[in-house]
């Protein structure tokens, strides 16, 4: 399988809520010993791999905002944590699962990036991730609204 | 803050049957790997198996034929049964919290356990 | 299974020095490996993750490197607190396994 990532730039004015959005594609094993975790954070382009380090999202790391569920189930991260940072991660029955951030600040800007971990009990982890950018603004020449820019190629890298 | 608490006897018989018990408090066991991790006296670290969130098991394949790994999420609480131990079996376990795609992040203290008769 | 072997056994140096320690793997692991450090009685504690990141609160002085079956560890400058023993682990695949450790001493 794959992630997709529809938008690879996302331009917001401060205050504003913005949703990033990534979605799997391809065959999606929903076998009996198959689960997902998915999860998102904040990263750097590294020298290394794009979504490589793993840094928070307001605080909260990674293991804070995962979803966790078998191929099929929609799912949502713990709410109360997530919600007191103005964030909400979830996922639905199709195969997309987004991050909802709430009253962006300039602080937001940066390098976003999905994970979604497919778990073969028995024989390995899979590995994919999508990334992209925020740009929060202000002042006169910031957007009313987000702004979305769709992704030139829209199949991540894929990285086992 | 998640902590681990490993607890179980620490002497026993030859050809009997480890158990082991694993508590975890200040967070939530649905989700992530629940992992055993064993280390003999003096020596490395080996890792027995986990129990999934969902219930789903793997095991180390020299242990397998010997491992039986167990959850109970109304107790939070996780646990291991070892059958036909020997002294080799004799070593300091484990529990520890893994997380796909990560790595072992919060350990219990570990408990020594040693089999002889 | 997939067969980690650090090397040296044992490493003796000065608080102040750089510490420089390997593991090799029997066959390609990515990056997806982990460091630990375990201090006598104590549990491991995770170091470095996907061979180069620092997990939360372990200091600068501590990195990683390295890629498919050659890999690093990094003390650029030894605290009293950091003579310990080191492992490895890889988690391409199952079963997870351990390197066999580095011990740090004193000189």
């Known amino acids: 399988f794959k992630v997709a990532t529809p938008y690879s730039l996302y331009v917001c004015p401060e205050g504003q809520q913005v949703t990033l959005t990534c979605r799997l594609l391809g065959p999606v094993d929903k076998g009996h010993d198959v689960t997902f975790y998915k999860t998102w954070y904040r990263s750097s382009r590294g020298e290394v791999q794009t979504c490589s380090e793993r840094r928070p999202i307001r605080n909260l790391t990674f293991q804070d905002l995962h979803l966790h569920h078998g191929g099929h189930q929609a799912a949502n991260t713990s709410h109360d944590l997530a919600q007191r940072h103005g964030l909400e991660s979830a996922s639905d029955h199709h195969g997309q699962f987004s991050i909802t951030m709430r009253n962006l600040t300039l602080l937001d800007s940066g390098l976003y990036c999905c994970l979604v971990v497919e778990i073969r009990h028995h024989h390995s982890e899979h590995r994919v991730h999508g990334a992209m950018e925020l740009q929060v603004q202000t002042g006169k020449d910031a957007p009313s609204n987000c702004v979305v820019y769709p992704s030139s190629s829209q199949d991540s890298e894929n990285i086992t | 803050q998640v902590q681990l608490q490993e607890s179980g006897p620490g002497l026993v018989k030859p050809s009997e049957t480890l158990s082991l018990t694993c508590t975890v408090s200040?967070?939530?066991?649905?989700?992530?790997?629940w992992s055993w991790i064993r280390q003999p006296p003096g020596k490395g670290l080996e890792w027995i198996g986990y129990i999934y969130y969902s219930g789903s098991t793997n095991y180390n394949p020299s242990l397998k034929s010997r491992v039986t790994i167990s959850v109970d999420t109304s107790k939070s609480q996780f646990s291991l049964k070892l059958s036909s131990v020997t002294a080799a079996d004799t070593a300091v376990y484990y529990c520890?919290?893994?997380?796909?795609?990560?790595?072992?992040?919060?350990w219990g203290q570990g408990t020594m356990v040693i089999v002889s008769s | 299974e997939i067969v980690l072997t650090q090397s040296p056994a044992t490493l003796s140096l000065s608080p102040g020095e750089r510490a420089t320690l390997s593991c090799r793997a029997s066959?390609?692991?990515?990056?997806?490996l982990a460091w630990y450090q375990q201090k006598p009685g104590q549990a491991p504690r995770l170091l470095i993750y996907d061979a180069f990141n620092r997990a939360t609160g372990i200091p600068a002085r501590f990195s990683g490197s390295g890629s498919g079956t050659d890999f690093t560890l990094t003390i650029s400058s030894l605290e009293p607190e950091d003579f310990a023993v080191y492992y490895c682990q890889q988690r391409i695949n199952w079963p997870l396994t351990f390197g066999g450790g580095t011990k740090v001493e004193i000189k």
């Open positions: 066959q390609s692991v990515s990056y997806y």
């Open positions: 520890a919290r893994d997380i796909p795609a990560f790595a072992f992040d919060i």
């Open positions: 200040g967070g939530s066991i649905s989700s992530y790997y």
